[in-house]
């Protein structure tokens, strides 16, 4: 490409006319501000193409870049073009006008930028200032481009003097944008709502300043659009939030709500979804069954736990034998209901060092205005067995009797056993079980009584021994679900003068 005059910089007089010519081996065209001004194109006999641009009645606004480029770049070097910069000093034009977007300069990293304030006269002295400051900033100036350097997030103006008149440019605003990989979080005020209540969702992006939110939701699919609201969380820098609010939810609003966020600077994107359930009315549901008979061991602590789901949040009460329970000041009973997730609860009744009196009928009631559950169970206090008495007697009938009395809850079983060889028993020889009906030498009689007040069973068992011819170790063992207890007595024949 050949341009005449060759430039690269020309200074022309205002109101004059000037002709620019460009020629090349293929069709050529002049461009000014990305447009093709009126020009004359021709093809010479030698096959050379040319274009003539005539600039008439020049003004300062004709100041700027002019390019000559190939009209059809097929098969040619696409980047071949010639640049010419023309100044038309014009005292009536201060700074050349900018498009609105040129006044706002956005940065995503610390980098050199240009504040594009340009004048029509290359001889003018131009200075750069902060908008509210008089001090000229030490930034190099190029009359064809403007001030280039690294700038802070501020507002700037350029100044020059034309004759005796000081001229200010428009203000330029530099913004350093925070741009990072997008991290979206979506949450809802409630993920479960009753019909008629509101659905409110929030989509928050951290680390970016300019993003675009797009929501998809069940209502949108049926053509009913909801306008989200976007705001900036002032107390948290670079937090942008989009709020989707659906008043008076319907059952059809149940489903997946997705927030899609795009950031156009680096073309990043992320999306998160959340499920919303709209229920016709509130509910209570149990997660797991509690047996209708529960056990606790005397003097031990016992926690009874109920896990349930409810919406709206319920009131939880515990009762014993139809009387309301509360945390006891003595620390014998502790009640707690924890909200372990939005709609899930764990309610616990803890009995500290269980007493017999704490046996009874317990009910947990969880309720709200729509629904309830009453969970009931009987609490049985298990008491380890104790042998309270083991005694031997010699009735006149000649037989010998051994009486064993013990208590416990649940009902104890009684086991009688005897050992005839005192030296070797019970270590070497196992004791013989007594009381089997087949054995004629012993008879057994057992009575069981339930003591309502103490809530435990008493077992009284009498062993009748028909003839004892040598010392005999008789053992009474009581056993129930929570333990066993044993006592032993030596029974001697009538004829022997001593008893152990």
């Amino acid at each position: 490409l050949v341009v005449t005059p060759p430039g690269p910089e020309l200074v022309l007089n205002v109101s004059s006319t000037f002709v620019l010519t460009c020629s090349g081996s293929a069709p050529v065209v002049w461009e000014r501000m990305s447009q093709e001004p009126p020009q004359e194109m021709a093809k010479a006999q030698d096959g050379t193409f040319s274009s003539v641009l005539t600039l008439t009645n020049l003004t300062g606004l004709d100041t700027g870049e002019y390019f000559c480029t190939h009209n059809d770049s097929r098969g040619l070097e696409t980047d071949e073009r010639k640049r010419l910069y023309i100044f038309v000093p014009d005292p009536t034009v201060g700074f050349l006008p900018n498009d609105a977007e040129e006044l706002f300069i956005f940065l995503t990293e610390i980098t050199e930028i240009t504040i594009p304030c340009r004048v029509t006269d290359p001889q003018l002295v131009v200075t750069l200032h902060e908008k509210k400051g008089d001090v000229a900033l030490p930034v190099p100036y190029d009359h064809q481009r403007g001030f280039s350097g690294i700038f802070e997030d501020r507002s700037y103006i350029c100044k020059t003097t034309i004759g005796d008149r000081e001229v200010d440019s428009d203000a330029y605003y530099v913004y350093r944008l925070q741009v990072s990989s997008i991290n979206v979080s979506v949450n809802a005020v409630q993920t479960v709502v009753r019909q008629g209540e509101n659905i409110t969702l929030m989509c928050i992006v951290i680390g970016n300043e300019v993003v675009n939110f797009e929501w998809t939701y069940p209502r949108k699919e049926s053509g009913r659009l909801v306008e989200p609201v976007t705001d900036f969380l002032l107390d948290m820098p670079y937090h942008i939030r989009s709020i989707l609010h659906i008043p008076s939810a319907e059952l059809e609003d149940s489903g997946t709500y997705t927030c899609n966020v795009t950031e156009s600077v680096n073309d990043h994107q992320d999306e998160k979804a959340i499920n919303i359930t709209v229920v016709e009315s509130g509910y209570v549901r149990l997660l797991g069954e509690v047996g209708t008979l529960q056990f606790a061991e005397l003097h031990r602590s016992r926690t009874l736990q109920v896990v349930f789901e409810a919406y709206p949040p319920p009131t939880v009460l515990w009762f014993k034998d139809n009387r309301t329970l509360g945390d006891s000041s003595a620390g014998e009973i502790a009640l707690s209901t924890r909200n372990v997730s939005e709609t899930r609860y764990v309610s616990e009744l803890t009995l500290v060092r269980v007493k017999v009196a704490e046996a009874g009928h317990y009910t947990m009631r969880a309720f709200h205005e729509d629904a309830e559950v009453q969970l009931s169970f009987q609490l049985q206090i298990n008491v380890p067995v104790r042998v309270l008495e083991l005694s031997e007697s010699h009735p006149d009938s000649g037989e010998q009797t051994v009486r064993c009395r013990g208590r416990g809850m649940p009902q104890p079983n009684i086991i009688w056993s005897a050992c005839r060889d005192l030296k070797r028993c019970p270590r070497e020889l196992p004791p013989t079980l007594l009381g089997n009906s087949s054995e004629e030498e012993s008879q057994l009689e057992t009575n069981v009584t339930y003591w309502e007040e103490e809530q435990e069973f008493e077992v009284v068992s009498t062993l009748r021994l028909q003839h004892v011819d040598r010392p005999l170790s008789v053992r009474c063992t009581l056993r129930n679900a929570v333990g066993q207890d044993t006592q032993e007595v030596i029974v001697v024949p009538h004829s022997l003068p001593f008893k152990v």
């Epitope: 229920v279 549901r285 149990l286 997660l287 069954e289 509690v290 047996g291 629904a371 009453q374």
Partner: nanobody, 124 residues
Framework: EVQLVESGGGLVEAGGSLRLSCTAS????????MGWFRQAPGKEREFAAA????????GYKESVKGRFTISRDNAKNTVYLQMNSLKPEDTAVYYC?????????????????WGQGTQVTVSS
């Protein structure tokens, strides 16, 4: 698959009583939470009462509490709703429902199996 058949509905004067029964077949009854729901003319179906698998947990809609009693007999595969002091606003079709999902629930959507319903009409 569980089939549920309700019975015991009918016409009764205000203040009277009815006992609804629901018999299940085709499944292990004791593994289902059972519920009674009702639907009055022109209204949505609503929870009335529910009972857990072992009968240890029960619950009622506030407006029927103290008047209705739910119970079950796992040996007979039957759940009952004893309705006393009936009011005209209790008029509805009463549906029996079974839930495998939870041991007890008042939420209609938790119930997998439904009966055809039995009409209860309370005249004033």
């Amino acid at each position: 698959e569980v089939q549920l058949v309700e019975s015991g509905g009918g016409l009764v004067e205000a203040g009277g009583s009815l006992r609804l029964s629901c018999t299940a077949s085709g499944g292990t009854f004791s593994t289902y939470a059972m519920g009674w729901f009702r639907q009055a003319p022109g209204k949505e179906r609503e929870f009335a009462a529910a009972i857990s698998r072992n009968g240890g947990s029960k619950g009622y809609k506030e407006s029927v509490k103290g008047r209705f009693t739910i119970s079950r007999d796992n040996a007979k595969n039957t759940v009952y709703l004893q309705m006393n002091s009936l009011k005209p606003e209790d008029t509805a079709v009463y549906y029996c429902a079974a839930s495998r999902t939870y041991t007890y629930s008042t939420a209609m959507k938790d119930y997998n199996y439904w009966g055809q319903g039995t009409q209860v009409t309370v005249s004033s």
